[in-house]
Interface confidence: medium
């Protein structure tokens, strides 16, 4: 029985050049975290493997760092990083959980406009 | 080129135990998650055991917790499964696999060998 | 344990013919199913993960969708060295498990 839900940050949005937190967070489950991938769309991001610790994907190795947590901050974002973000954790014995962030990287102007309407 | 060989099988008596070995070649081991797939005679496949990278974690069906073992020497790239207590419903090909988390699958599977419990 | 069914258990068909076989879960599996093949006397092989997406070396006659509770896996020209056991299996939650398999015979 998967009784655990997934907080993340919701939709959020950031601007072109800044860096953002991607954050989930697994609550209302004593399931063991073996690891946490992060994919944007198809893509691997990054894993947080409880035995082998962080790998970030080679190509997103300049943008991507780990943390705070099993979170994941992007750096140096471009307008081509707005989509989806999925926060995947796999856990014993329940199973996967999974997480979704949108993310809209916006020119500076507008993202300081916009800031106050993101939805938490 | 990814190699996974099972050894260990044979037949055993109903009570008795056997302990397979699985010899991992081709990537690296100590970076991967493991798992035992069986298959009885002419049946379908069943998952019998999980263990993660470092052997921290250890996952097993209800069939067979308490009675199965699951463990692995990242130093010699083998995968273990001790098994005890064996029943008749044991008898299976008994496969190694390379479980990738990133992939939700098992990715490699070894040629599979045969434990046939039986007086 | 989340039950994996899968159908038709055999089927016969002709090398070109289009071949369908669909799994179906007892619950929300997300798009945490595999497809393996298995040919008589060898281990499985991984063809499709993540429900949809090819495994490597697999060919493009191959594919597969689906999500949630119904999945399809689809040979769109049935070629001779097809003809073998499918089976369809859930990463979503322990245990993991398998569909009962479907044979793919020659007509």
């Known amino acids: 029985m998967m009784t655990g839900t997934i907080e993340t940050t919701g939709n959020i949005s950031a601007e072109k050049g800044g860096s953002i937190i991607l954050q989930c967070h697994l609550s209302s489950t004593t399931a063991q975290v073996t690891q946490v991938n992060w994919e944007q769309q198809d893509q691997l991001l990054a894993i947080c493997n409880a035995d082998l610790g962080w790998h970030i994907s080679p190509s997103f190795k300049d943008r991507v760092a780990p943390g705070p947590g099993l979170g994941l901050t992007l750096q140096s974002l471009t307008v081509n990083d707005t989509g989806e973000y999925f926060c995947i954790y796999h856990t014993y014995p329940d199973g996967t959980y999974t997480g979704r962030i949108f993310l809209e990287v916006l020119e500076s102007s507008v993202a300081e406009h916009g800031a106050r309407f993101q939805i938490p | 080129e990814v190699q996974l060989v099972e050894s260990g099988g044979g037949l055993v008596q109903p009570g008795g135990s056997l302990r397979l070995s699985c010899a991992a070649s081709?990537?690296?081991?100590?970076?991967?998650?493991m798992s035992w797939v069986r298959q009885a005679p002419g049946k379908g496949l069943e998952w019998v055991a999980t263990?993660?990278?470092?052997?921290?974690?250890?996952y097993y069906p209800d069939s067979v917790k308490g009675r199965f073992t699951i463990s692995r020497d990242n130093a010699k790239n083998t995968l273990y499964l001790q098994m005890n207590s064996l029943r008749a419903e044991d008898t299976a090909v008994y496969y190694c696999?390379?479980?990738?988390?990133?992939?939700?699958?098992?990715?490699?599977w070894g040629q599979g060998t045969l434990v046939t419990v039986s007086s | 344990a989340i039950q994996m069914t899968q159908s038709p258990s055999s089927l016969s068909a002709s090398v070109g013919d289009r071949v369908t076989i669909t799994c179906q879960a007892s619950?929300?599996?997300?798009?945490?199913l595999s497809w393996y093949q298995q040919k008589p006397g060898k281990a499985p092989k991984l063809l499709i993960y993540?429900?949809?997406t090819l495994a490597s070396g697999v060919p493009s006659r191959f594919s597969g969708s689906g999500s949630g509770t119904d999945f399809t896996l689809t040979i769109s020209s049935l070629q001779p060295d097809d003809f073998a056991t499918y089976y369809c299996?859930?990463?979503?939650?322990?245990?993991?498990?398998f569909g009962g398999g479907t044979k793919v015979e020659i007509k």
């Open positions: 299996q859930q990463g979503q939650t322990y245990p993991f498990t």
């Open positions: 263990i993660s990278s470092g052997g921290s974690y250890t």
């Open positions: 081709g990537f690296t081991f100590s970076s991967y998650t």
């Open positions: 696999t390379r479980w990738l988390l990133s992939l939700y699958a098992m990715d490699y």
């Open positions: 619950q929300n599996i997300n798009v945490w």
């Open positions: 993540k429900a949809s």
